[in-house]
C-alpha cells in the first residue's frame, strides 16, 4: 500500500507541474519517529488543500485514492495518541514541490518500519 502511495505522490507532482498553484503548505521536513502518525495526518490534510485549489479531477481522484490507501495502512495505529508532537499549524510553510518531497520521505519511514 505505501508503495502505491508514493506512486500517487509522483502522479500528483506530474499533474501539478502543468498548473500554476502558488499555495504554501504546512510541511514537516524532519519527522521524529514518535510523531510520524501525527505528521502523516498533517500531510494528508494539506494534500486536500492541493486538491481543492487545483480544481482538477485527476488530482482530486489521486488524492482521494492516496487517503484511502493511507487510511487502510494505518487502520491499526491511526488512533494512536502521540504526545509532544507539533500541531499542523506550527509547521513550516513550504511550496508544493518541497511539500511532496517531504511527504515521500515520511512514507518511506512507514515502509521501513512495516
Amino acid at each position: 500500500n505505501w508503495v502505491n502511495v508514493i506512486s500517487d505522490l509522483k502522479k500528483i507532482e506530474d499533474l501539478i507541474q502543468s498548473m500554476h498553484i502558488d499555495a504554501t503548505l504546512y510541511t514537516e521536513s524532519d519527522v521524529h519517529p514518535s510523531c510520524k502518525v501525527t505528521a502523516m495526518k498533517c500531510f494528508l490534510l494539506e494534500l486536500q488543500v492541493i486538491s481543492l485549489e487545483s480544481g482538477d479531477a485527476s488530482i482530486h481522484d489521486t488524492v482521494e485514492n492516496l487517503i484511502i490507501l493511507a487510511n487502510n495502512s494505518l487502520s491499526s495505529n491511526g488512533n494512536v495518541t502521540e504526545s509532544g508532537c507539533k500541531e499542523c499549524e506550527e509547521l513550516e510553510e513550504k511550496n508544493i514541490k518541497e511539500f511532496l518531497q517531504s511527504f515521500v520521505h515520511i512514507v518511506q519511514m512507514f515502509i521501513n518500519t512495516s
Partner: antibody, heavy 122, light 112 residues
Amino acid sequence: EVQLLASGGGLVKPGGSLKLSCAASEFTFSNYAMSWVRQTPEKRLEWVATISRGGDYTYYPDSVKGRFTISRDNAKNTLYLQMSSLRSEDTALYYCARRVSMITGGWAMDYWGQGTSVTVSS
Amino acid sequence: DVLMTQTPLSLPVSLGDQASISCRSSQSIVDITGNTYLEWYLQKPGQSPKLLIYKVFNRFSGVPDRFSGSGSGTDFTLKISRVEAEDLGLYYCFQDSFVPYTFGGGTKLEIK
C-alpha cells in the same frame, strides 16, 4: 432530480457471467465517484465496488475481488458491473449509488438507483 | 475487516415514541485525518435505501430534524425523537472509513 436506473440483471448459472448497467441522469456524472451495493434475500446490505470520478481507481471487498469489475463511461453517463465466476451467494438485488466526495463532502452514498435482481442458480 | 454490529434487530414502537438504534464497530472508525465516515440509511418497504445521516451527525438534505445521529470512536446511535408512520422500515449503519466498507445487519422499526 438525480436519477439512477440499474438494468441487466437476470437468472444465470453458477460459473456464469453477467454485466449490469446503471444509467445516470439529472446530474454531472463525471463529478461523482460511484458504487455498487447489493442486498441479499435476507435483506443484508453488502458493499460491492466503488470507482473514482475519472475511473482510474477501483475498490472491492475480497468477496468479489478478481471476479467483479466496476467501470464507467462518462461520455455515456453510465456505470457498469461486469460479474464473472458467479456463485449462489452472489444472488441479490444490485443497487448503483452516487458517492459524495471525501474531500468536499461526507463520502456518503447520497442517491441510490432502484436495483436490478441477479439470481445465480442451476 | 471492520465488523458493524447493530442492536436491536427489531424495534417495535408506538407512533409518537422515541426510538434509538445502536451501532458498534469492531475497531475505531476515526480515519487518519480525524474524520469518522459513519452513515445511517433507511430503506422503506419496497424502496431503495436512502441516506439519512452522514459523518456521524450530519443530516442529509430534506431529512426531518426528528432524526439525529451521535457517537464517536466505536459507538454510534441514531435517535428518532417522535416516530411517524413514514419512518417505518429497515435502518442500516455503514462505515466507509476503511476498505472494505461495511454495513450493520439492519434494524427493523415496526409498529408495536
